[in-house]
Structures are given as C-alpha cells and as structure tokens.
C-alpha cells in the first residue's frame, strides 16, 4: 500500500474533495486548472494529457456553474467532426444540446470554452490559454 | 466519534482538499462559494456567517491565484475605517499593501473584488452578488 | 454604459513625441484587450496597436513598430499610447477601442486628433 | 502584410438590398468583421465572425463568405445606412495584427 499515505476522517456536516492533482481546484469532485501559457489546441490537448488530465469537458451546468463566472476564453476540448458537422469532446461523445451556446468567431474546428457556457469556434493553430479537467472517480 | 463517518486513502501523486462546505470550490484548502443573488455588504457578510464562513478575504496573489480569473464584481469581506482611512479585513487585519489595486468607483466604504486583483470602492448598501470563503484547519 | 475617451492630441512636429490618453468606464477593463485604430484625414481606418488586458502581450503595426509603444493602468482604468519619432504620415484621428474578441471592436472613442506638422 | 481590397463606392435604392464585398487571401482563413462609420463619428461594428450581430445591429444585416471574398449585405436598405463600411481581418502573416480594407462608401438613393 506504498502509494497510499494519509488516512483522514471527515466531518459529516463538511467533506472533502477530490483527489485532485496538487493545487488544482476542485469543485463537486472534478478536478480544474487554468493554464496562463498561450498554446495552440494540440499543444493543449497534450499538455493536459501529460497531467492524466484532459482539456476541459463541460457535461452539465449544475455540476460545473463555476464555469459560468470564468473570464477571457480558453481552449476546450470540443472539436468539430467535418464528417458528419457534429462537435465532440476529446472522448468521443457528442456536445449535449442546449449546454453550451456555440459562436462561430472564426474559421475552425475547434472551441474555446467563454463565460457563461459560451464555445467560441476558432482555427485549432491559434495560441490561447487553456483549461485541464480531471474527472475524480 | 459520530460525526465521523468516512475513512479515504490518499494516493501520494494527488491530495483532497478541504474539508469545506458540501457544493463549494476547494482550492489550495480554501473554500470558497460565489453567491448569485444580490445583496447589500452587511446582508452579504450575514449570509456568509450564516454558513459558518466569511466574505472574501484576500491575503495571497498565490495562494488564490484562482481569483485572477474572476469576472465580474462581487462584495469580499474589506471596509474602510474612516477614523484611521485604513481598509481592513472582517478578522481585524489591515489590508497588505500590493495585494489589491483599490479603484474608487464609488463613494462608500465597503470594497467589491474585481478580476485580477482589484478592488472597487462601493456605497455599502448597493446590492451585490458576493464570494463567501472559510479558511481550513 | 462603456465610455472610452481619448485625450493627448494636439499639433507637434516631425520627430516629436506624444502621448494619448483613453480613460474607459462602464466595464471591467483589465478583463478586456485593447486597440488603438487611426484614421487619416479623409482616409480609411488603420489598425495601429492592440495590448490584452493584463498588458503582457503588445501588438504593432508594422508602420509604427520601434516608435510606437501601447501600454495600460489597470488601476486608474486607462490606456495609453506613447508616439516618438513622429512623421507626416501619422497626422490621423486616433481612436481607442475595446476589443469584443481579438480583432472583433465592439466599443469605439470619439477620437483625438494628432497633426504632425513643421 | 494582407490586403484587403473593397469598392469605393455603391449606391442602392431605398428599400432595395445591397451587397458590399471584400478581397483578400486572409479572408480565405479568417472571417471578416464590419464597421459603418458615419461622418464625423467612430466607427461601429456590425457584422462580426461568421454572421453575427452586436446587440443594437438591426437584423437587415448580414454577413457571409466564400472563398477569399467577404460579403456585407443590407437587406431593405434604409436611408440611416448611408455610411462608410469598412471590412476588417487578421493579418494572414501574424494572427496578433489585423488590416482594414480601403472602405466603401454607400449611397442610398
């Protein structure tokens, strides 16, 4: 059980959230960092990914309402599929319908995540801040 | 030992944060919670001690570097003394200096806090939306 | 309601320096990008200088770039652009303006007036 | 640095639509924006990404593209949009600066 190094007991009337990857915050058990370095879509993709993260998927207003007081935009993890014109996440599933309000800024196909459950489309090579989520299980 | 009701391993890679308020942001083992409805600073700080906790109080640019992404304006826990014209915390302590750029945008006493690090001067009975926040152990 | 005024225009001569001045309310300025856009008299508009709203990253024209430079006080909400090595050519209105996303303006200022002029 | 190139001038009948175009091989990446400007006052943009509206724009407005050109399009023309209309883009050889195109002054007749 080398891995393992703490054994804590938790209030009833508080809890505690997590586990989150060091100074990460952590709200209703997912885990979020914003990222300040400017990066394009891949480079984010693979930023996250090397943290055991992902870029940011936004599943459910309730859930994640703290999205909603974000400011400037950041890459998310949303991704238009020309194929078939759908947008889906990183993991494959569809962008759920009346989540997010999708503004086509520009020529792309990929979204920047915007306050108050905005997607911006934008070209995936332009350099923007990004935001990694980690699901806790 | 009845409050006591849960027993976690903590994998050394990553941590809990908290304890905090069931629903609330843990970051850096602060909790916070950004309240919607709008209210004056003293109905504001009442709501928050309602809930075993204080208005915003800012005391580090890195331990709360999450406030930096914050839009809006919201009431925190700083009013002015005017028999000294210092700002001070709800606990007591003076505001230290560089931790906040103070814009007077109003005639008042009470201090909304703005995106990166700022503070708005505001009549303390405008009604606001406001951050609640409870330091852990 | 947004409000962007500019000041700090006037008459100077070739190779004199000016600085303009924008005081913005009615928003949360730090959270947003900012651009300086000329006009020439009787001319079309020209992008001039853009600096995002913590004021780490400044962009320039290439016509103005070394003599140009952008800059902002976030505390006292205002922007700022201070015009060295001034020509001719750069005799134009002055507008500031706040940036809806990149490139996209949302919020102009009435102008000032430079006129470079011996 | 790009270019983008517009007529210098149209005219339109009242009531009637109108089409302003835009020209540049920056256009071919990016969507343009556009600002009315009227005499003796700033500009105010109208038209920005694919086609979207600011708050206050009447719907009469529109924008589309095709290829490397930007199209402005005032459907039932009313005699307050007489203006100059100015397109704008990001520069095709760095994203961080952007051009306007020469402007195009609209009569409405």
């Known amino acids: 059980n080398s891995l393992f190094n703490q054994e804590v007991q938790i209030p009833l009337t508080e809890s505690y959230c997590g586990p989150c990857p060091k100074n990460w915050i952590c709200y209703k058990n997912n885990c979020y960092q914003f990222f300040d370095e400017s990066k394009n879509w891949y480079e984010s993709q693979a930023s996250c990914m090397s943290q055991n993260a992902s870029l940011l998927k936004v599943y459910s207003k309730e859930d994640q309402d703290l999205l909603k007081l974000v400011k400037s935009y950041h890459w998310m993890g949303l991704v238009h599929i020309p194929t078939n014109g759908s947008w889906q996440w990183e993991d494959g599933s569809i962008l759920s319908p009346n989540l997010l309000t999708i503004i086509e800024m520009q020529k792309g196909d990929c979204a920047l995540y915007a306050s108050s459950f905005k997607g911006y489309i934008e070209n995936c090579s332009t350099p923007n801040t990004y935001i990694c989520m980690q699901r806790t299980v | 030992n009845s409050l006591f009701n849960q027993e976690v391993q903590i994998p050394l890679t990553e941590s809990y944060c908290g304890p905090c308020p069931k629903n609330w942001i843990c970051y850096k083992n602060n909790c916070y919670q950004f309240f919607d409805e709008s209210k004056n600073w003293y109905e504001s700080q009442a709501s928050c001690m309602s809930q075993n906790a204080s208005l915003l109080k800012v005391y580090s640019k890195e331990d709360q570097d999450l406030l930096k992404l914050v839009k809006s304006y919201h009431w925190m826990g700083l009013v002015h003394i005017p028999t000294n014209g210092s700002w001070q915390w709800e606990d007591g302590s003076i505001l230290s200096p560089n931790l906040l750029t103070i814009i007077e945008m109003q005639k008042g006493d009470c201090a909304l806090y703005a995106s990166s690090f700022k503070g708005y001067i505001e009549n303390c009975s405008t009604p606001n939306t406001y951050i609640c926040m409870q330091r852990t152990v | 309601e947004v409000q962007l005024l500019e000041s700090g225009g006037g008459l100077v001569q070739p190779g004199g320096s000016l600085r303009l001045s924008c005081a913005a309310s009615?928003?949360?300025?730090?959270?947003?990008?900012m651009s300086w856009v000329r006009q020439a008299p009787g001319k079309g508009l020209e992008w001039v200088s853009a600096?995002?709203?913590?004021?780490?990253?400044?962009y320039y024209a290439d016509s103005v770039k070394g003599r140009f430079t952008i800059s902002r006080d976030n505390s006292k909400n205002t922007l700022y652009l201070q015009m060295n090595s001034l020509r001719a050519e750069d005799t134009a209105v002055y507008y500031c303006?706040?940036?809806?996303?990149?490139?996209?303006?949302?919020?102009w200022g009435q102008g000032t007036l430079v006129t470079v002029s011996s | 640095s790009s270019e983008l190139t517009q007529d210098p001038a149209v005219s339109v009948a009242l009531g009637q639509t109108v089409r302003i175009t835009c020209q540049g091989d920056?256009?071919?990446?990016?969507?343009a924006s556009w600002y009315q400007q009227k005499p003796g006052q700033a500009p105010v943009l109208v038209i920005y990404?694919?086609?979207n509206r600011p708050s206050g724009i009447p719907d009469r407005f529109s924008g589309s593209s095709s290829g490397n050109t930007a199209s402005l399009t005032i459907t039932g023309a009313q005699a307050e949009d007489e203006a100059d209309y100015y397109c704008?883009?990001?520069?095709?050889?760095?994203?961080?600066?952007?051009?306007f195109g020469g402007g195009t002054k609209l009569t409405v007749l």
């Open positions: 303006a706040k940036e809806l996303y990149r490139e996209y303006m949302d919020y």
């Open positions: 009615g928003f949360t300025f730090s959270s947003y990008a």
């Open positions: 600096i995002s709203g913590s004021g780490g990253s400044t």
């Open positions: 920056s256009l071919r990446s990016y969507y």
């Open positions: 990404g694919k086609n």
């Open positions: 704008n883009s990001r520069d095709s050889f760095s994203i961080h600066q952007n051009v």
